[in-house]
Interface confidence: low
């Protein structure tokens, strides 16, 4: 899908006269009739398989045509095609003269014709314009031309849809070829998959838009590369999630049996020797001269 | 506001088909892009196939070549035939429906509306 784009920039008929040589009463009142069609080795009548438009009437005898895009859009002369561009086209442009106000063909006697051209050949798609002036022994034409593809459309023949976006279906726009640029933060085939905070564990994080990192059960952390011990682990990490290895001194299912009573508390007293006997217990060796639990006596 | 009643999910056996129907109504305009995306138990929604309005046709990789998604335009409706389904293709199957403003406004990135529908269970049996 495309455009094909001719823009009209002179047109000089010094003595005012048809193609007949017979002159304009009271000039030339010139208006232009485009085909593009197929290419064809002999530029031959039949359809305008490409398009057709037609201009008002521009001018009197020789003017200058003023670029009118950003007005009623008739110059450049726009002719959409929704086919792939095949590289090779044929143009004819007629200059006729419009006595009245009636410019359809069918309105027109048949002598009204002023000059009439066409040219064939290949012509690649771009933003290019190819300058050409056509010249009969009456009449001057110049005029440039280009093919540009449809918004949306890319490729060396238009034939290439991208939409930029920025949703649920894809973060990207288009390259001049129709492949995809992702927006940044967006990664994979189609630039639906978030690019997660740079460090974001691999496996035990994950992300739904750029820059985030969200973790799975189990983890937890800016990065999700701690992970979480067991409910109600005291004194214990993890190495994966919901473990309890007991730090040092520490025992059971928690890590919340003391061990090591005699470090954490010193209950023994008066200078007595203290023995861990298991979770909570102890043993203190009296010196001499005192007893008790704690030798405390 | 835009409908989507998604139908054709089940319980099927390893190796079998299904033909998933998303029907859109309501007010559809501008460009409109539909597609199917699931949801296994326990796993982030995830995109499977999706359709343009020019016809372009996207998979993901792990359904290639099995699923093909198409849609009728007169009927604001899009397909989905899974073949050769397999164990982990297990899920609730969500439609997508993606439509841009009439407004929109090339200069910028298009404005898209989404709409999601309520799902249908995906149940294959090995």
């Known amino acids: 899908s495309g455009v094909f784009q001719l823009q009209l920039q002179e047109f000089i008929n010094e003595r005012g006269v048809l193609a007949s040589g017979r002159p304009c009463e009271p000039g030339c009142r010139t208006f232009f009739r485009v085909c593009l069609k197929h290419f064809q080795a002999v530029v031959s009548p039949g359809p305008c398989t490409f398009g057709t438009v037609s201009t008002p009437v521009l001018g009197t005898n020789s003017f200058a045509v003023r670029d009118d895009s950003s007005g009623g859009g008739r110059n450049p002369l726009q002719l959409p095609f929704n086919f792939t561009w095949p590289g090779t086209f044929s143009l004819i442009i007629e200059a006729w003269h419009a006595p009245g106000d009636d410019l359809r063909p069918e309105a027109l006697p048949p002598d009204a014709l002023i000059s009439k051209i066409a040219i064939q050949g290949s012509l690649a798609v771009g933003q290019n314009w190819l300058l050409d002036e056509q010249t009969s022994t009456l009449t001057r034409l110049r005029y440039s031309y280009r093919v540009i593809c449809s918004d949306n459309y890319y490729g060396d023949n238009c034939s290439r849809l991208c939409k930029k976006r920025n949703d649920h279906f894809g973060h990207y726009v288009c390259q001049p070829d129709g492949n995809l640029s992702c927006l940044p933060g967006w990664t994979g085939e189609y630039c639906q998959q978030p690019i997660c905070l740079s460090g974001c564990h691999e496996q035990n994080g994950y992300c739904s838009k750029p820059a985030e990192c969200l973790c799975r059960p189990g983890w937890q952390g800016r990065l999700c590369n701690e992970c979480i011990p067991h409910n109600g682990c005291r004194h214990g990490t993890c190495s994966t999630p919901w473990q309890c290895t007991c730090d040092e001194g520490w025992g059971g299912l928690f890590c919340d049996q003391d061990l090591n009573y005699c470090t954490h508390h010193s209950p023994c007293k008066n200078g007595a020797t203290c023995s861990n006997s298991g979770q909570r217990s102890y043993t203190c060796t009296c010196r001499p001269g005192y007893t008790g639990v704690d030798c405390e006596l | 506001q835009v409908q989507l009643q998604e139908s054709g999910g089940g319980l099927v056996q390893a190796g079998g088909s299904l033909r998933l129907s998303c029907a859109a109504s309501?007010?559809?305009?501008?460009?409109?892009?539909m597609g199917w995306y699931r949801q296994a138990p326990g796993k982030e929604r995830e995109f499977v196939a999706g359709i343009n309005d020019g016809g372009n046709t996207y998979y993901a990789d792990s359904v290639k070549g099995r699923f093909t998604i198409s849609r009728d335009n007169a009927k604001n409706t899009v397909y989905l035939q899974m073949n050769s389904l397999k164990p982990e293709d297990t899920a609730v199957y969500y439609c997508?429906?993606?439509?841009?403003?009439?407004?929109?406004?090339?200069?910028?990135?298009?404005?898209?509306?989404?709409?999601w529908g309520q799902g249908t269970q995906v149940t294959v049996s090995s």
């Open positions: 309501g007010s559809i305009s501008g460009d409109v892009e």
């Open positions: 997508a429906v993606s439509t841009t403003y009439p407004s929109y406004n090339e200069s910028q990135y298009a404005d898209w509306l989404a709409y």
